[in-house]
Interface confidence: low
């Protein structure tokens, strides 16, 4: 397996204001072993894994605010370390293709 | 970034509980590549039940197998061609 | 070796579609993304959108939703690309190309086609 | 993206570079092209820094941030080509605007 933190840039959406600021944090990926199983035991589901967060922090960041609206303060995960694992459906989306990290709706992209 | 090197590719390898001299048994392993990172506010905004994170995975799966029936009767999959898909056990 | 084989050039008429295709060999079709790209004199290289034949899994470039279509067949190893609607705007070489890592739409593009001229005239 | 040079004259064994600016940070996912005058394209260098399979090692890549370049250390005829950059950090991946690369 090769999965690992890797540094990425997020998008921060400031709905109200439509504008993004973009953070550099650091997240996981890479690559993890997985098998098909030729023999389906209904008793036995197979586990396939996947790389994600084995331990996660939560930081927050100010946006700035604009026109009528103050500045706020956004609460995002970051991971600490990584691994292949199931991936916990509880708090994450389990997905084959997300709209990735650094997605803004707005044009507008704030440093 | 991570090194596609440090990991075999999902290939077609025999498993050695099922086979049988003559008659291998194949089945499809290796690495796929997947991700994790904070879930946009555009995708939260679509979820009934909203998750901070999102994990984008495929899995080492059998693009195409033969149903054989082995010694002790057992039913398995001979694997015929393996692809990096959709994964539909990795979820806890 | 891996090689992209796109169809030959098209000359068709506005408001018409067509379909252009991508004959990929020397690989696992199944396990790679595969993008196309567009490319038109003094406007650069743009991201039409990509596949990912293992699923079937499509992504698009908001610009190109409603004009490109991207399919693939897997029997055939080859991916096709419907433009529709064809306007002036449409004349252009466009490119498909597959990415880097197996599973993975992201890396961007290793392997690259010969590329296919659509002109659009009436 | 943007390249900010859109042709460039050296000659034969120059060191030559091309740069690229990101209008946000890319976290380093960023690839340069070449587009040879018959039209193909080969990828020289992706993930800011590491070079491709089978492209020649005078090619070399670097920056981080907004700010990336390749580099041509010993410039030859067959690098007669324009070289695009592309970030695969946001979607819609975009790329460069171009930089052609003539002889003096």
């Known amino acids: 397996n090769s999965c690992e933190l890797t540094n990425i840039t997020i998008a921060i959406e400031k709905e109200e204001c439509r504008f993004c600021i973009s953070i550099n944090t650091t997240w996981c990926a890479g690559y993890c072993y997985t098998r098909d199983l030729v023999y389906k035991d209904p008793a036995r589901p197979k586990i396939q894994k996947t790389c994600t967060f084995k331990e996660l922090v939560y930081e927050t960041v100010r946006v700035p605010g604009c026109a009528h609206h103050a500045d706020s303060l956004y609460t995002y995960p970051v991971a600490t370390q990584c691994h292949c694992g199931k991936c916990d459906s509880d708090s994450t989306d389990c997905t084959v293709r997300g709209l990735g990290p650094s997605y803004c709706s707005f044009g507008e992209m704030k440093e | 970034a991570p090194d596609v090197q440090d990991c075999p590719e999902c290939t077609l390898q025999e498993n050695p509980f099922f086979s049988q001299p003559g008659a291998p048994i194949l089945q499809c392993m290796g690495c796929c590549f997947s991700r994790a990172y904070p879930t946009p506010l555009r995708s939260k905004k679509t979820m009934l039940v909203q998750k901070n994170v999102t994990s984008e995975s495929t899995c080492c799966v059998a693009k195409s197998y033969n149903r054989v029936t082995v010694m002790g009767g057992f039913k398995v999959e001979n694997h015929t061609a393996c692809h990096c898909s959709t994964c539909y056990y990795h979820k806890s | 070796e891996v090689q992209l084989q796109e169809s030959g050039a098209e000359l068709v008429r506005p408001g018409t579609s067509v379909k252009i295709s991508c004959k990929a060999s020397g690989y696992t079709f199944t396990n790679y993304w595969l993008g196309w790209v567009k490319q038109r004199p003094g406007h650069g290289l743009e991201w039409i959108g990509d596949i990912y034949p293992g699923g079937g899994y499509t992504n698009y470039n908001e610009k190109f939703k409603g004009k490109a279509t991207l399919t693939a067949d897997t029997s055939s190893s080859t991916a096709y690309m419907q433009l529709s609607s064809l306007t002036s705007e449409d004349s252009a070489v466009y490119f498909c190309?597959?990415?880097?890592?197996?599973?993975?739409?992201?890396?961007?593009?290793?392997?690259w086609g010969q590329g296919t001229l659509v002109t659009v005239s009436a | 993206k943007t390249q900010t040079t859109s042709s460039l004259s050296a000659s034969l064994g120059d060191r030559v570079t091309i740069s690229c600016s990101a209008s946000?940070?890319?976290?380093?996912?960023l690839n340069w092209y070449q587009q040879k005058p018959d039209g193909t394209v080969k990828l020289l260098i992706y993930y800011t820094s590491s070079l491709h399979s089978g492209v020649p090692s005078r090619f070399s890549g670097s920056g981080s941030g907004t700010d990336y370049s390749l580099t041509i250390s010993n410039l030859e005829p067959e690098d007669i080509a324009t070289y695009y950059c592309?970030?695969?950090?946001?979607?819609?991946?975009?790329f460069g605007g171009g930089t052609k690369l003539e002889i003096k």
């Open positions: 946000q940070g890319i976290s380093n996912y």
């Open positions: 190309a597959r990415t880097p890592l197996y599973g993975s739409s992201y890396g961007g593009f290793a392997y």
């Open positions: 592309q970030q695969y950090s946001k979607l819609p991946w975009t």
